[in-house]
Each structure stands twice: as C-alpha cells, then as structure tokens.
C-alpha cells in the first residue's frame, strides 16, 4: 500500500515522499527511489520564502516611484522586497501597493499620532482648554494662553479653534 502522508519537509509524489526544496530554491525535478529532489536557487530578482515544490520562483515586488513607493528592504532569494512610501505619504494597504498623502488635521483638531510610511495621521478634537487654528499634519492642540500668569484678564473666551484674547484688568476709580 503506497504512503498517503509524508513528514513536514517532504511531499508526496508518485507514491514517494520527496524532500521539499529549501527557501530560496525552486523544484527542478522530483525525487525517485534512487535520486534526491533536484532544486535550483532562485535568480537575483526572485524569491521563495517557504519549503516548497514550486517550479517557478516569485518575482520580487517592484516599488514603483510613480506610485510614491520606495524600497525599505531589498529582497533576497528567501524574502520579498519590502516597499514603503516616500516622505509625506503612507501606504493604502498592508501590502503597500500604492501611497496617498498624509491627511492634515483641520482647525479644531490636533495631531494625536504623526503619520508614518505605513499609517495615516491620527487626529483628535481639541479638548476644552486647547485649540488648533491651522490645518496641519504635525501640530498638536495647543493650550489656551493663561492670561492670569501675564497679569491680564480674559477679554474673549477661547474655542477649539481660537486662543483666548487677554487684555488689561479694569482699574476701579477711587
């Protein structure tokens, strides 16, 4: 009765358990009773990242500059190229096939987390006591000016988009 299963680094072919090819190599010919599996290294622009029986290696990913992509890590025979986005851009998906500009936080919102090559800007509404009057991908909400520390009084209350306006204290006449 021929085998129906093989060990993990083997594969079943013609009632035989043959050795899989190591990462970085592709299958040229299956084993026989008397010859081992024949494998060949992937070429410079290709890779295979698992023990395999593939007859073709996979092409390395191309980081297309027209899509805002650049190489983060060059591929090897065992690993794919890793792309990232140019400055000011981030990936649209986990596989990073294209890039879009980082979003800016509108007035009334500040930057909670600055964007990276793989994640967009995270904005948060400015809480009471803070404001942002600019559209920015970097600026956090800033605290309202403290009039008291300048020996001034609030003449105009602040909002999430504007700072308070300070003015001199009214002097009472004798």
């Amino acid at each position: 009765e021929p085998p129906t299963a093989c060990r993990e680094k083997q594969y079943l072919i013609n009632s035989q358990c043959c050795s899989l090819c190591q990462p970085g190599q592709k299958l040229v010919s299956d084993c026989t009773e008397f010859t081992e599996t024949e494998c060949l290294p992937c070429s410079e622009s290709e890779f295979l990242d698992t023990w395999n029986r593939e007859t073709r290696c996979h092409q390395h990913k191309y980081c297309d500059p027209n899509l805002g992509l650049q190489v983060q890590q060059k591929g090897t025979s065992e690993t794919d190229t890793i792309c990232t986005c140019e400055e000011g851009l981030h990936c649209t998906s986990e596989s990073c096939e294209s890039c879009v500009p980082h979003r800016s936080c509108l007035p009334g919102f500040g930057v909670k987390q600055i964007a990276t090559g793989v994640s967009d800007t995270i904005c948060e509404p400015c809480p009471v006591g803070f404001f942002s009057n600019v559209s920015s991908a970097f600026e956090k909400c800033r605290p309202w000016t403290s009039c008291e520390t300048k020996d001034l009084v609030v003449q105009q209350a602040g909002t999430n988009k504007t700072d308070v306006v300070c003015g001199p204290q009214d002097r009472q006449r004798a």
Epitope: Q16, E33, E36
Partner: antibody, heavy 127, light 107 residues
Framework: EVQLLESGGGLVRPGGSLRLSCAAS????????MNWVRQAPGKGLEWVSY????????DYADSVKGRFTVSRDNSKNLLYLQMNSLRAEDTAVYYC????????????????????WGQGTMVTVSS | DIQLTQSPSSLTASVGDRVTITCRSS??????LAWYQQKPGKPPKLLIY???SLEGGVPSRFSGSGSGTDFTLTISSLQPEDFATYYC?????????FGQGTKLEIK
Amino acid sequence: EVQLLESGGGLVRPGGSLRLSCAASGFTFGSYEMNWVRQAPGKGLEWVSYISSSGETTDYADSVKGRFTVSRDNSKNLLYLQMNSLRAEDTAVYYCARDVFFFDSSGDNGAYGMDVWGQGTMVTVSS
Amino acid sequence: DIQLTQSPSSLTASVGDRVTITCRSSQGIRSSLAWYQQKPGKPPKLLIYGASSLEGGVPSRFSGSGSGTDFTLTISSLQPEDFATYYCQQLNSFPSTFGQGTKLEIK
C-alpha cells in the same frame, strides 16, 4: 535539558484500553514532529505512529491502524497514544521519540532522524 | 511497505576490531536512513542520519555510507562501550520501518 517522559503503562486485559502520555520539556514542543515506537520483550524496534507538529497529519503502522490514535496538546507539551482493542501482541515497552529534521543550508537536501527518546513505559496485555 | 534487512543478526568481535554492519532496503530510499545504538534497558540513541551524517556528540569512529538500497555502519576501532544492538531505520516514507537489529557481542 531536553527530555521526554512517558507514563500511563500497566497491565490491561485483552480488548481493554489504555492511554499513554509523553511529557516534553526543554524544547519548543509545538515545533517538532513526534513518534511512538515500541519494543516487545526481547525483540526489535517497531515504529507505531507519527504526528506532525500541528497535529494535522498522523500515520500508523498497519498492525495498530484503526485501534490506536495519536494526538497532542501543544499548550501542555503533551503527546498521547490512545490504545483500544488491545491484544497480547501489543505487549511492549512504548517509547515516544522526537523527529528532527537535520538541515545544513549548504547541503542539497535535509534528513530526518529520531534524536530524543523517552525512557519508555511498559504495557502488558494479558488475561 | 519498505523492508529493511540487517546483516549479520549477531556479531562477535574484540576491542580494537573494525566492524561493518549492513542494511539492505527492499526498495530505493535514497539516503533516508538512520542508525541507532541500543543498550539493554535503555532507549535507542541516534548515531547517524541521512545515511552518512554523524549526530553531534557521537565518536568519529562511527561512520555510515550508502545510498539507494545498500547501506553500511562501520565502527573503525571497537571500544568496550560499543557492545550493544544496532538498528537501521528508513525515514523515506510511512510506515517508517526498522531493521531487525544486529547484536554486537564481545569476543
């Protein structure tokens, strides 16, 4: 220290059942394929069963197929052999053994061997 | 199933002797063969894997050769601790099988 320790052996009547356990320590159990091998008194070694690292693939010697079931619990580092419909000819010392894949990246193909064995547990099937 | 036949079944030799044990497979198994040493009351110990690769910590007096159907285990100069039973095993395909063993005794 890398170790395997079998337990659960004993005397059982023909037709009875027994569950053997093998506790692994000193290595990442869930990364290794495992085997049960037995040795009848005064006889040679007989491979009994195999289980892949995930437990997805199993295989058995013809002499135990349909009666024995191998399983594993990687969270507890335990290997099991459930033995049903036991016969007198199942009397043996039962060893659990670790399958290892030896591989040198400069070489063409790797090779398997059983590099770690337990001390064994005796199973006697008798009326 | 693949059958493995070891010869001789038993062998008497002296310390310092060169000893060869053979293992023949009923079908080609390339180099998917391992050799084990077993002493009474103890589990087997892996000596050779892949027909000719020495397991770590095994003395260099042990060597393995062969491919396809014919394999040999050689002990170049027997030491007192080498008297034991030796088994070959094919790991080419399931069911995995062992040879019947070769008992090496002191003369």
